[in-house]
């Protein structure tokens, strides 16, 4: 059939952070090439990464069209130099990916503390609103734009002189917390989507400490 030495892709895996979404698979090709197709449950399959020798395909442009849809991808294997060849069933070898729902599954990227400001016994910490590749009206949306109140941030903070951590939560990108006047604090933030069953939390942001040479205001 011409596909004697062609092997089907396996270990199809979605890698997605802040909706930047790549499908990866194995094996590294030997005398074969791959084409990827992606579809929602509509079954309107769209081909991407034509006849590639890569073992990954960036599907971001497709999934950002509707991040709440569920997607399936499939990877077709063709003999190198004979891409018209088909398998015994009259079609090229292919394997399906797991289903992927971006809104429910994309990893939330590590947040970044944009700035902090102290006024007396109040400390205001602002989390940078990361931009995604999701578009609306030709504008890239932020994580907050996409997730709305589904996204919360948790602030972990502690006095520089002690190890006892406190937490605060917000469904905006700002925290306003009570602190002891004259004390320096360290803090980090974590993004959380409580309604999720998987990938609920981001990794913690880098720790920021007051009174260090970066100063009290970061932009």
């Amino acid at each position: 059939s011409g596909t004697t030495n062609t092997v089907a892709a396996y270990n199809l895996t979605w890698k997605s952070t802040n909706f930047k979404t790549i499908l990866e698979w194995e094996p590294k090709p030997v005398n074969q090439v791959y084409t990827v197709q992606i579809s929602t449950k509509s079954g309107d399959w769209k081909s991407k990464c034509f006849y590639t020798t890569d073992t990954e395909c960036d599907l971001t442009d497709e999934i950002v069209k509707d991040v709440k849809q569920t997607y399936l991808a499939r990877v077709f294997s063709y003999p190198a130099g004979n891409v018209e060849s088909t398998g015994s069933a009259g079609e090229p070898l292919y394997e399906n990916s797991p289903e992927f729902t971006p809104y429910l599954e994309t990893n939330i990227g590590q947040p970044v503390i944009q700035k902090y400001e102290q006024g007396g016994t109040k400390l205001k910490v602002t989390v940078k609103d990361s931009f995604t590749l999701v578009r609306r009206n030709n504008t890239f949306l932020s994580l907050r734009d996409v997730f709305g109140k589904d996204l919360i941030y948790t602030l972990y903070y502690w006095k520089s002189s002690s190890s006892g951590k406190k937490t605060a939560k917000t469904n905006t990108n700002e925290f306003l917390i009570d602190v002891d006047k004259g004390e320096n604090y360290c803090f980090s933030v974590q993004a959380v989507i409580p309604s999720r069953t998987v990938n609920r939390k981001s990794t913690d942001s880098p720790v920021e400490c007051m009174g260090q040479e970066k100063g009290e205001f970061r932009e």
Epitope: K41, G43, W45
Partner: antibody
Framework: EVQLLESGGGLVQPGGSLRLSCAAS????????MGWVRQAPGKGLEWVST????????YYADSVKGRFTISRDNSKNTLYLQMNSLRAEDTAVYYC???????????WGKGTTVTVSS | DIQMTQSPSTLSASVGDRVTITCRAS??????LAWYQQKPGKAPKLLIY???SLESGVPSRFSGSGSGTEFTLTISSLQPDDFATYYC????????FGGGTKVEIK
């Protein structure tokens, strides 16, 4: 509630034509591939045809290729099966089904009976 | 075309029995298999997809397993409502159904 309701079945002579319809409700029709499956009296299930959500992709079983045409009108939430050059072996209950990705059938209609006989 | 062979074609069992139905594919279909239940005069009902994923609303006594060419549908404790005909369906290459297994009262 997701519902599918087939209509258009009946008695037709060999060589004749029939058009089946399937009215869908309770879900966003254009978001799903749809299909037809049939069951001859006392027999098992046989896949007939599938159409993608946009109507741009269609698939047919070899037994009906060239004789049957699947189509859909997303503005009317309706699936169709135009059956031409009907044969006695096309006699069956025809089920309309919602088919995610065009792969498996997660919701079925009650079926409509097509009898091809002289 | 991929052929699907179910066995047995008929199975006699009693309420409370553990029932296993087998489906074999003529070539590897990975995990791209669904199971349906059909009662006389009624439309089929999806039980399992992707070989082992339980459809929403289906009782947990139903389970599916297998990959490649051999698959099983298991009913852990047969209930009166489970006497019916069961079909497997592959969706690796187009769609084909198995011939069916009728589960009847012993």
């Amino acid at each position: 509630e997701v519902q599918l309701l087939e209509s258009g079945g009946g008695l037709v002579q060999p060589g004749g034509s029939l058009r089946l319809s399937c009215a869908a409700s309770g879900f966003t029709f254009s978001d799903y591939a749809m299909g037809w499956v049939r069951q001859a009296p006392g027999k098992g299930l046989e896949w007939v045809s599938t159409i993608s959500g946009s109507g741009g992709l269609t698939y047919y079983a070899d037994s009906v290729k060239g004789r049957f045409t699947i189509s859909r009108d997303n503005s009317k939430n309706t699936l169709y099966l135009q059956m031409n050059s009907l044969r006695a072996e096309d006699t069956a209950v025809y089920y309309c089904a919602k088919a995610p990705y065009g792969y498996y059938m997660d919701v079925w209609g009650k079926g409509t009976t097509v009898t091809v006989s002289s | 075309d991929i052929q699907m062979t179910q066995s047995p074609s008929t199975l006699s069992a009693s309420v409370g029995d553990r029932v296993t139905i087998t489906c074999r594919a003529s070539q590897s279909i990975s995990s791209w298999l669904a199971w349906y239940q059909q009662k006389p005069g009624k439309a089929p009902k999806l039980l399992i997809y992707k070989a082992s994923s339980l459809e929403s609303g289906v009782p947990s006594r139903f389970s599916g397993s297998g990959s490649g060419t051999e698959f099983t549908l298991t009913i852990s404790s047969l209930q009166p409502d489970d006497f019916a005909t069961y079909y497997c369906q592959q969706y690796k290459s187009y769609i084909t159904f198995g011939g069916g297994t009728k589960v009847e009262i012993k």
